[in-house]
């Protein structure tokens, strides 16, 4: 059968009935539903929610939705022995004691099972000592700390801002400097937009509110202590001590004004410039320990939490495709929370909901995609990604043969200024395309493109009359398809004026004030950006499950990789000595990207003049386009992060947020001048070149003529 | 509306004690810090204890230190300050307020209540 | 421990402009407060964090912070604005909240 005769409906008409589908007031009666109560992992609650979307799914019309179910490392605090900090003084006393939870919400206060602010996996512990300011305790922070203020925080107890980077890259860097315990909290500077009022009144972070979030180093492992492998009923599990990315230091996160109470004593050496400086009513000294008359005092962390193996479920739901079943084009996002989720994740759950209800309809009415389409309701994203890995982990020979591409649906807003995606070069054209197709919802753009508007907010810094598209990072449910199975991947989600808001993310994620109220009030009272957000992730899934030749352009990864080709080049070249004494050198690998460039041309050629009715060459082509973003995958992994296995692509090493390109070179080159031996450092910097070079020519010759 | 309301007020003889209540509506009690102010006949205002929001802090004027008990109960919507070992000097009117937002430090009381009254006299 | 010292009494005329001082030792590094107190009620909070208003005080009333003395100012004062004015801070180093000992504000005629 041809395309058009399985889909039974003509494929302009398709999209535009998908599309047409959707709508803002069923996400907005969605999110409400997912909001009421906390979905926390591991608990009864999420388990749930997860058997009301499962019966819902099926309601909508998908051919079947499963509960797939692991038994993975989870987090909570002890709930008769409660996580706090204390100032104490000589005699042991406890002075001050930072909030045992969250001034609730108005509307909120009688309701069960929200969970105290915490750090999740932090061990158990009661350090007490000096207090260290390590600003964001980014790895440059130290750097400042130990190599230019020669401050040593071995012993100490640090306090560190979020922002900026993952928590976990925080912690790991307190540890290697050789602290005994890490207090986490938001500063105003990061979490306070002037001019806004602070939650109900605005969404703007109260003094009370804190941030949750998990502080493991997993680097792609999944549940902890089954690295590699699915968490099922036979699994054979790793002792605790043997467990990935458990960090070995007690850690607790604290809102701004318990924050104040202890920085306000802080003596020892004042900030190193204004970059240390938030914006509380404190000198920001960095220690260690207390000033004057409170220099006998010492802060003492209380921290009880415990580490559980629990049973987690995520909802698989599937339609079948008409054409090419055995192609899977997956939809997933998260469904549990840290509290009530009303922006992370249930922004993006409530989007999924509707995207599957179109789906739903437009297979009631008789039409099917070329493609199978999977959507995915993960669990236990908070806690490490788990759900997602240990699914992927699973099944993982099936989606690295069958993957066609992975678009994630976390939360769906972050602001509502303008349109953010990170993906894979391959759908660059494809978001291109689409978001010219899409109505922009912004005020002062009636009757435009959300193309256009995107593009007017956030152009891109290369290409002029074009909009930013970031490198995929991690932090989110992508990362196991992407980073280790080389699945092309792509997220969308709306988002705030970086310019103007130098905050990090947004202020009220992961406290108990993201509610329903948050964003029905403050961010998407209309829930038009909620829609758009719904047309950009659907209508991706709905090209990329029903174009007869798969919407990936590979001449857009050539022109990437000859940007990052460069910008690593540079990097190296502030080295030009050592480059010289040790004869590094990048021809290999510009040579690999100038082949690739070619024989990504060429396949373009050939992708316009085909025969696009012989339905072995039309599968042969779309196969190579599947698999070039697989043949970016080295089967050995980076060095010490074996799940991270995307040559050209990896979460940073300093910031598991952001992505770094070239990262086996990357890291090699990073801090290079303080090694001890340069010429292992180097001869390392020689072998990633190679091993980057390789890698290119390799995936370069995947789109060659097959003979 | 947001309001305070102040009981239990008495005469009572020095060494006595006597418990004070301030019931509270109107807002969300539980995530608000909470003072006891008095204020003795003809005087100006004396600050006396403080609760944290979660209870997890109590500070004492050092007048009242190890003498008074500031304590909340949540459930109950309800601040109380048992007093002990009163002195003629506790005499005053007592008021309960409420800090405007959840710290109770470094912030103003923006909701007072009407306060109750204990005379402490032989 | 820390002190807040407050005139015991300002006078103005009706119309003019009131200020009545509150003085303490680095008082601007402290958020500062002030209270309205008529005589038989309870106090009312007029300015917070040094000049923030709450909702339904007067714009007339105003405050400023820095340095060892923090204002409050009434503008076009009226016969209403009659009462005691008490300035309070947080003392971080005894953990006290500190009130000042009062201002007796009378406007005349």
């Known amino acids: 059968k041809s395309s058009n005769e399985a889909t039974n409906i003509t494929p302009k008409h398709n999209m535009k009935a998908f599309l047409d589908e959707l709508k803002a007031e069923n996400i907005k009666k969605f999110l409400y539903n997912f909001t009421q109560i906390p979905h926390l992992a591991g608990t009864e609650q999420n388990f749930q929610l997860a058997k009301q979307i499962q019966s819902q799914w099926k309601e909508f019309g998908l051919d079947s939705v499963e509960l797939a179910h692991y038994d993975v490392l989870l987090s909570y605090p002890n709930k008769t022995h409660p996580n706090y900090i204390s100032i104490i003084n000589e005699d042991g006393n406890e002075i001050f004691n930072t909030s045992l939870f969250e001034p609730p919400p108005p509307g909120y206060e009688n309701v069960s099972d929200i969970v105290p602010p915490f750090s999740a996996f932090s061990p158990q512990g009661m350090p007490e000592g000096d207090l260290v300011y390590v600003n964001y305790a980014r790895t440059e922070d130290f750097f400042k700390l130990e190599r230019d203020m020669k401050i040593n925080c071995s012993g100490k107890i640090v306090i560190a801002r979020y922002g900026k980077v993952f928590r976990g890259n925080k912690v790991k860097n307190a540890q290697l400097a050789g602290a005994k315990g890490v207090i986490l909290y938001s500063d105003p500077a990061d979490y306070f937009a002037p001019g806004v009022k602070s939650y109900p009144d605005g969404w703007n972070l109260p003094g009370g509110g804190v941030q949750r979030g998990n502080i493991l180093n997993l680097n792609g492992a999944g549940d902890p202590l089954t690295p590699g492998y699915p968490a099922n009923e036979y699994a054979y599990r790793r002792g605790i001590a043997e467990a990935v990315g458990l960090p070995s230091i007690p850690v607790h996160p604290i809102g701004y004004y318990d924050a104040q109470k202890l920085l306000e004593k802080m003596g020892g050496s004042a900030p190193p410039d204004s970059s240390w400086r938030g914006s509380l009513k404190v000198p920001y000294n960095v220690g260690p320990g207390f000033t004057g008359n409170f220099s006998t005092q010492k802060v003492k962390m209380h921290i009880h939490s415990t580490n559980e193996v629990t049973r987690i479920y995520n909802v698989i739901g599937t339609l079948r495709g008409a054409v090419e079943p055995d192609r899977y084009v997956i939809l997933g996002g998260h469904r549990d929370s840290w509290v009530f989720g009303g922006i992370d994740p249930q922004s993006g759950a409530a989007v999924v909901h509707e995207i599957v209800r179109s789906f739903g309809t437009l297979k009631k009415e008789g039409w099917r995609p070329r493609r199978t389409i999977l959507f995915a309701s993960w669990d236990a994203e908070e806690f490490g990604l788990l759900g997602s890995t240990e699914w992927a982990e699973e099944n993982s020979r099936l989606l690295q043969e069958r993957g066609v591409a992975y678009i994630n649906a976390d939360s769906s807003i972050e602001g509502n200024y303008t349109l953010r995606v990170d993906c894979t070069p391959l759908m660059y054209s494809l978001v291109h395309n689409l978001t010219k197709e899409l109505k922009s919802p912004d005020e002062g753009f009636e009757g435009k493109s959300l193309y256009e508007s995107w593009t007017k907010k956030s152009p891109s810094p290369e290409f002029s009359g074009m909009p930013r598209i970031s490198k995929l990072g991690s932090g989110n449910d992508f990362e196991v398809f992407f980073q280790r199975l080389g699945i092309a991947s792509g997220r969308a989600r709306y988002t705030k004026n970086w310019e103007t808001n130098k905050f990090s993310g947004y202020p009220l994620y992961h406290s108990v004030y993201e509610t329903y109220e948050l964003v029905e009030k403050f961010y998407d009272p209309m829930f038009k950006y909620h829609l758009t957000v719904a047309q950009v992730r659907g209508g991706m899934v709905f090209e990329l499950a029903n174009s007869i030749v798969l919407p990936f352009d590979c001449r857009d990864y050539a022109v990437v990789l000859r940007k990052y080709a460069d910008k690593i080049y540079s990097i190296s070249m502030k080295h030009p000595q050592e480059m010289k004494t040790y004869s590094v050198s990048f021809d290999s690998l510009f040579s690999a990207v100038k082949n690739f460039t070619e024989i990504a041309s060429k396949f373009s050629e050939r992708l316009q003049d085909f025969d696009k009715s012989n339905p072995i060459v039309l599968r042969m082509m779309n196969d190579q386009l599947m698999f070039l973003e697989r043949a970016f995958i080295d089967p050995l992994g980076l060095p010490d992060r074996p799940f991270y296995r995307h040559v050209i692509y990896a979460p940073s090493s300093h910031n598991k947020y952001a992505g770094e390109s070239f990262p086996g070179i990357y890291d090699a080159l990073f801090d290079i001048e303080s090694k001890v031996d340069p010429s292992k450092a180097w001869g390392e910097v020689k072998r990633q070149i190679y091993v980057a070079a390789f890698t290119v020519q390799a995936a370069a010759e995947t789109l060659s003529e097959v003979a | 509306q947001v309001q305070l309301q102040e009981s239990g007020g008495d005469v009572v003889q020095p060494g006595r004690s006597l418990r004070l209540s301030c019931a509270a509506s109107?807002?969300?009690?539980?995530?608000?810090?909470l003072h006891w102010v008095r204020q003795a006949p003809g005087r100006g205002l004396e600050w006396v204890t403080l609760?944290?929001?979660?209870?997890?802090?109590?500070y004492y004027a050092d007048s009242v230190k190890g003498r008074f008990t500031i304590s909340r109960d949540n459930s109950k919507n309800t601040l109380y300050l048992q007093m002990n070992s009163l002195r003629a000097e506790d005499t005053a009117v007592y008021y309960c307020?409420?800090?405007?937002?959840?710290?109770?430090?470094?912030?103003?009381?923006?909701?007072w209540g009407q306060g109750t009254t204990v005379t402490v006299s032989s | 421990s820390y002190e807040l010292t407050q005139p015991p009494s300002v006078s103005v005329a009706p119309g003019q402009t009131a200020r009545i001082t509150c003085g303490g030792n680095?008082?601007?590094?402290?958020?500062v407060h002030w209270y309205q107190q008529k005589p038989g009620q309870a106090p009312v909070l007029v300015v917070y964090?040094?000049?923030d208003r709450p909702s339904g005080i007067p714009e007339r009333f105003s405050g400023t912070n820095s340095g060892n003395t923090a204002t409050l100012t009434i503008s076009r004062a009226e016969a209403g604005d009659e009462a005691d004015y008490y300035c309070?801070?947080?003392?971080?180093?005894?953990?006290?909240?500190?009130f000042g000992g009062g201002t007796k504000l009378t406007v005349l005629g």
């Open positions: 307020a409420k800090t405007t937002v959840s710290d109770p430090y470094y912030y103003g009381m923006d909701v």
């Open positions: 109107g807002f969300s009690f539980s995530g608000y810090g």
């Open positions: 680095n008082i601007g590094s402290k958020s």
């Open positions: 609760i944290s929001y979660d209870g997890s802090n109590k």
């Open positions: 964090d040094d000049s």
């Open positions: 309070q801070v947080w003392d971080s180093s005894s953990d006290h909240v500190v």
